[in-house]
């Protein structure tokens, strides 16, 4: 559905915004899913959203960083697939993923979102509905 495509695209833009301020983020290592198994993508996104990404509380970028993090964590209306995955016992727990510094954490988050957009488009048999 287009609203989920839009949501994924918006998350990518927010991640890109945060990447501009990576030096102002708390350097704590965070669980960063990579090579996520099929049907566990939404579960992995949930892990990215739950991670304790935070501002290092330095300088005048703190407000935009905190706002971006808040937006990154905002839950969008769930799809059926999303709801099913979040309750799948076979998906890895968030703590089981390798921990990475904020820069790699954001890169992996973006990579997963891009993969999901690609999957979503590949599953469409026809052209554009609304771009």
């Amino acid at each position: 559905q287009d609203r989920h495509m839009i949501r994924m695209r918006q998350l990518i833009d927010i991640v890109d915004q945060l990447k501009n301020y990576v030096n102002d983020l708390d350097p704590e290592f965070l669980p960063a899913p990579e090579d996520v198994e099929t049907n566990c993508e939404w579960s992995a996104i949930s892990c990215f959203q739950k991670a304790q990404l935070k501002s290092a509380n330095t300088g005048n970028n703190e407000r935009i960083i905190n706002l971006s993090i808040k937006k990154l964590k905002r839950k969008s209306p769930s799809t059926g697939a999303e709801r099913r995955q979040k309750h799948r016992l076979t998906c890895p727990s968030c703590d089981s993923y390798e921990k990475k510094p904020p820069k790699e954490f954001l890169e992996r988050f973006k990579s997963l979102l891009q993969k999901m957009i690609h999957q979503h488009l590949s599953s469409r048999t026809h052209g554009s509905e609304d771009s």
Epitope: D2, I6, R9
Partner: antibody
């Protein structure tokens, strides 16, 4: 049908500010973010930034950071783009464009801003 | 920032010609590329999104291809209404447009 109607042409002096509006209709305003793009005379397109229409969250092109402010009014389904400290190089047509799933799917008609002393 | 370079900057062609416009990204952008058409005094219109997908209402004579850094917009048989300027735009990291390609009547 989706429509984005922009405010009229403006003439400004160097150093002044300009505020361009873009009124949306034909869809649920807060469901779609909005981009702003400009085009200097005879030149290409330049992305300025975007605004989340439901929460006023903004992402700006670093080139315009500190000079551009994007806002919205949900009661009138209108977004605004204000550019300050204008210089002659800011003479351009300014467009709003709807943030579609993967592209700018609908565009306003454009607003010509002329900066001249 | 990702730079987008279009070539040629202008070309002359006749109705019925096959026209090809290329766009090169300064880094890998996967398939995150769109194409827009703009006529003088008008706003741009979306033609193709995600490299090769036709926006609704766009004639099938338009097609897009490519991946990574090199992309192509092809008009299989140029029609009178196709004389315009065409822009590529990346959306891998925020947004950047190419410089445009003006398609003129020969």
């Amino acid at each position: 049908q989706v429509q984005l109607v922009q405010s009229g042409a403006e003439v400004k002096k160097p150093g002044a500010s300009v505020k361009v509006s873009c009124k949306a209709s034909g869809y649920t305003f807060t469901d779609y973010w909005m981009h702003w793009v400009r085009q200097a005379p005879g030149q290409g397109l330049e992305w300025m930034g975007l605004i989340d229409t439901s929460e006023s969250y903004t992402i700006y092109n670093q080139k315009f950071k500190g000079r551009v402010t994007m806002t919205r009014d949900t009661s009138t389904s209108t977004v605004y783009m204000e550019l300050s400290s204008l210089r002659s190089e800011d003479t351009a047509v300014y467009y709003c464009a709807r943030y579609g799933p993967l592209a700018m799917d609908y565009w306003g008609q454009g607003t010509l801003v002329t900066v001249s002393s | 920032d990702i730079q987008m370079t279009q070539s040629p900057s202008s070309l002359s062609a006749s109705v019925g010609d096959r026209v090809t416009i290329t766009c090169r990204a300064s880094q890998d952008i996967s398939n995150y590329l769109n194409w827009y058409q703009q006529k003088p005094g008008k706003a741009p219109k979306l033609l193709i999104y995600y490299t090769s997908r036709l926006h609704s209402g766009v004639p099938s004579r338009f097609s897009g291809s490519g991946s990574g850094t090199d992309f192509t917009l092809t008009i299989s048989s140029l029609q009178p209404e196709d004389f315009a300027t065409y822009y590529c735009q990346q959306f891998h990291t925020l947004r950047t447009f190419g410089g445009g390609t003006k398609v003129e009547i020969k």
